[in-house]
């Protein structure tokens, strides 16, 4: 019977002509940097050509005894898990390996860099098709290894890695802290994340989603057919590497930021337990499992988007934190959030120029977070519009006049420390779609795009007194691109996307013994591209 | 793996190079700074990238890493640039006392230097 | 390209021995092992068994336990496969052929046991 | 390890489709996706035709099929032609070793 990871990654519904897993990603070469291998194993032989790059630390302990299966042990599963005959999820991908991990599965960054250098040349050397680079190894946070990943992803090169196993946030950890690389988390069978002893898979924002791995069966190198079951993020990190593998080979096209978009897209939603991670780290883990797409024809047509969250701002009264997309995604919209409530809420604004979404903490605040919403978004002609705090009882209101702009997403500013101990804002009238309104002292930033074919609709959702969580989703066939809330009192704690849901979170009048009738509304921006559609029903 | 502290194929003798008599200050701009990992026991003292400025060339790399040798012989130290980096990021590994950092962080083109550090199987 | 060329015929007297070579060329010896398949007069193929090149482990068929060694040389390319105490069921086609997979053979080695 | 079993003889016309089975257990055939198949002409060694239940090979012609449904394969050849003629062998994964069918001799009439 097929074992419960392969099981787990595939659609549920797909149609058998449509789907064959078989011999995915045979267009794809993908990279393994990890300890030596054996190459022969049946599970993987002539799949994985063992390069001459070696460079690993001496073992530690003066007895230290060099077991060849156990020098192979963890590269040899891996290998297994992403391109394995019978227990591979790419099995048609070729394979190319570099030591870098010693017998005791230690390396070091200085080796990794110089393992990732000489990916670069051999790919400058003989450029092939689509690459991936998996990295199925941790270390504490390096400037210099993130860096090295920036810049061999923007050559084009697809990098996976392990989030961590220490149950910590994976932020602290490199290479699974670096923007640029896929960094992926661990679950079980049950969905789960996966407990390793004491400690556990890594979380956080810094994850892009989970895949599985706990039990895992994969090649063994304790003979040339045997198997093993092995857990833990590296496992996870090769379901992933193996289903970007099989994503290129059938879209060899794809570039990082839309291969990211569609694993996300495709990926099972709020299926893992969140009670397991940290309190305050819930909302910055995504909860999404790695799946194959239902149909290895893509899905040019969709509008995709997802959620970034910033870095911590840190307490002080006048700190930031900024949420940034990737290079080839479009900023649609800028959202904050502050457990404490106290923050003067956020704007889009340009930084060398592309557009960062930047939140402000306020006086006697913990903190807040930045949540910005990228979107792939071709042809796309974006800006953002500002008005001022009206000052009049009105409030502010901001629109896109550009003709054929549409609004994709709605910020608010204030310098006042606590817009809830103003007069409070006037809703804003309904029938007006492509405007923004807010508190008249806050300024209101409207996000105006241009982009063929794109539309978008406001859609709400009230509810009386505040409530802890409002949320609102975009419907079928349409993608959130902006969530914000009205009115941006002290009860509001912020706004953020989860999938296609706009959550608005607000202190809970119970717990605040507050009396206001306020009500808190859920406001979500949702947008399709007509555009897309017709492209790709024309390829059909 | 490298050699045993003490095992140095590279020993550089305090000759006055040509380049040696060059401006030890970097260039004008901010100053590089170091990086180590916050984890004490994953540290690796004594093995430092040295991470030059974007543009900067292999042949220059080459250069500020001999400067980087003659200027840490002329004061009695021993180095060994285990490997000059290009083609992802400009910069050398070095093995070389943390006395030397100063000096280092002071060489021109520098951008940051990190303190080697270890990474395990997940 | 990729080639497997084996030694030439024996003729044994029961109860003796034979070591039949393959050597392998135009490949990265290390991705594959080399499996041995013999073939009777008139009859099937058998797989006797595997051996590696990257680490010398072997996988023995069942039947073959005890009576039989495979070994690789890497330096020369070569993998070996000797048969003890030969009996004249062991007359046969001796192949070797490349992994698991078996995608290239080598064109054959007669083994002849005789009294 | 007993052998898969294969028909020991089928035969067809010149531009015909045949097929053969090749019958195991959910412990080799049922269990992986490595069922191969051989042609062998007399006095020559055998050659790889499908590999992993339905591959072919490069320079193998596309007139040569494979499929697998529980625990038996099957390889279709279509448009027979006078050269196929040969015998044909299955083989498959068991979870230590390999297995060949006994094989099936094809008569092109």
């Known amino acids: 019977s097929i074992p419960w990871n392969l099981e787990r990654i595939t659609p549920p519904r797909y149609r058998a002509d449509e789907y064959q897993p078989p011999d995915g990603g045979s267009l794809v070469e993908v990279y393994l940097l990890d300890t030596s291998i054996q190459s022969d194993h049946r599970e993987i032989e002539g799949r994985v050509m063992v390069t001459d790059f070696e460079n690993v630390p001496e073992e530690d302990g003066t007895r230290f005894h060099r077991q060849a299966s156990k020098c192979d042990s963890h590269g040899t599963h891996l290998a297994g898990v992403v391109s394995g005959r019978d227990a591979g999820v790419a099995k048609g991908a070729s394979m190319r390996s570099l030591r870098v991990l010693n017998c005791q599965g230690k390396g070091t960054v200085s080796g990794t860099l110089i393992g990732l250098e000489f990916i670069r040349k051999s790919q400058l050397v003989q450029p092939v098709g689509p690459l991936v680079v998996l990295l199925p190894l941790a270390g504490g946070y390096s400037r210099v290894l993130n860096a090295a990943c920036q810049r061999l992803a923007r050559a084009g090169v697809v990098l996976v890695t392990a989030a961590g196993n220490f149950r910590d946030d994976a932020c602290l950890y490199s290479p699974a802290s670096a923007p640029e690389v896929i960094t992926v988390g661990a679950t079980n069978a049950q969905d789960q994340p996966v407990t390793l002893g004491t400690l556990g898979t890594n979380f956080g924002r810094c994850v892009d989603l989970f895949a599985p791995g706990e039990d895992i069966i994969g090649a063994s190198s304790d003979c040339s057919t045997c198997f093993v079951s092995q857990s833990g993020t590296s496992q996870a990190a090769a379901h992933v590497a193996g289903i970007a593998a099989m994503m290129l080979s059938a879209e060899p096209e794809l570039t990082l930021a839309e291969l990211r978009q569609r694993l996300i897209h495709f990926s099972a939603k709020d299926v893992i337990n969140e009670a397991w991670f940290p309190e305050d780290q819930r909302v910055l883990t995504p909860n999404l499992v790695a799946a194959l797409p239902p149909s290895t024809h893509g899905a040019g047509w969709q509008l995709f988007c997802r959620t970034v969250w910033s870095a911590h701002s840190g307490p002080t009264r006048m700190a930031t934190a900024i949420a940034r997309c990737a290079p080839d995604e479009e900023l649609l919209s800028c959202s904050s959030f502050s457990r404490s409530g106290k923050r003067r809420g956020e704007r889009m604004e340009a930084q060398g120029g592309k557009l960062v979404c930047r939140a402000h903490n306020a006086f006697g605040g913990e903190g807040v977070y930045a949540i910005a919403r990228c979107c792939l978004l071709p042809q796309a002609n974006c800006s953002v519009h500002t008005a001022p705090p009206a000052e009049a009882s009105m409030g502010t209101r901001v629109h896109c006049h550009q003709q054929g702009h549409v609004l994709t997403g709605c910020s608010s500013h204030w310098e006042v420390e606590d817009l809830g101990t103003h007069k409070p804002p006037v809703l804003r009238p309904r029938g007006q779609p492509n405007q923004c309104v807010g508190h008249r002292e806050a300024s209101i930033h409207a996000s105006c795009c241009h982009a063929p074919g794109l539309e978008c609709k406001v859609k709400e959702h009230g509810i009386p007194a505040p409530q802890g969580q409002v949320t609102v989703a975009c419907e079928e066939g349409w993608t959130l691109t902006g969530c914000s809330a009205l009115p941006g009192t002290s009860h509001v704690l912020g706004a953020y996307a989860v999938d296609n849901t706009c959550v608005v979170r607000s202190r809970d009048v119970s717990t605040t013994g507050s009396t206001s009738e306020e009500a808190v509304t859920a406001v979500a921006i949702c947008c399709r591209s007509r555009h897309l559609a017709q492209a790709s029903q024309e390829l059909q | 793996q490298e050699d045993e502290d003490g095992d140095y194929e590279e020993l550089v003798l305090a000759l006055r190079s040509e380049e040696d008599g060059l401006a030890e200050a970097p260039e004008h701009g901010t100053t590089a700074t170091f990086h180590r990992c916050a984890k004490d026991p994953w540290r690796l003292p004594g093995t430092y990238v040295v991470v030059l400025k974007e543009e900067t060339h292999l042949s220059q790399s080459e250069r500020t890493a001999r400067r980087l040798q003659a200027q840490a012989a002329r004061r009695g130290y021993l180095t060994k640039i285990l490997h000059v980096f290009h083609g992802l990021l400009p910069g050398f590994l070095v093995k070389m006392s943390g006395d030397l950092l100063e000096l280092a962080l002071k060489l021109p083109h520098v951008d940051y230097i990190e303190e080697d550090s270890s990474v395990f199987a997940q | 390209q990729v080639q497997l060329v084996q030694s030439g015929a024996e003729v044994k007297k029961p109860g003796a021995s034979v070591k039949v070579s393959c050597k392998a060329s135009g490949y990265t010896l290390t991705s594959y092992g080399i499996s041995w398949v013999r073939q009777a007069p008139g009859q099937g193929l058998e797989w006797m068994g595997w051996?590696?090149?990257?680490?010398?482990?072997?996988n023995y068929a069942q039947k073959l336990q005890g009576r039989g060694t495979m070994t690789t040389d890497p330096s020369t390319s070569t993998a070996y496969m000797e048969l003890r105490s030969l009996r004249s069921d062991d007359t046969a086609v001796y192949y070797c052929?490349?992994?698991?997979?078996?995608?290239?053979w080598g064109q054959g080695t007669t083994v002849t046991v005789s009294s | 390890q007993s052998a898969l079993t294969q028909p020991a003889s089928v035969s067809g016309s010149p531009g015909q489709s045949i097929t053969i089975s090749c019958t195991g257990t959910s412990s080799d055939v049922g269990g992986y996706n490595s069922v191969s198949w051989y042609q062998q002409h007399p006095g020559k060694a055998p050659k790889l035709m499908i590999y992993?239940?339905?591959n072919r090979p490069s320079g193998v012609s596309n007139r040569f099929s494979g499929s697998k449904s529980g625990n038996t394969a099957s390889l279709t050849i279509s448009g027979l032609q006078a050269e196929d003629e040969a015998d044909y062998y299955c083989n498959s994964y068991t979870s230590t070793s390999m297995v060949f069918g006994g094989g099936t001799k094809l008569t092109v009439l």
């Open positions: 051996v590696s090149f990257y680490n010398g482990n072997t």
């Open positions: 992993e239940v339905t």
């Open positions: 052929a490349r992994g698991y997979g078996m995608d290239v």
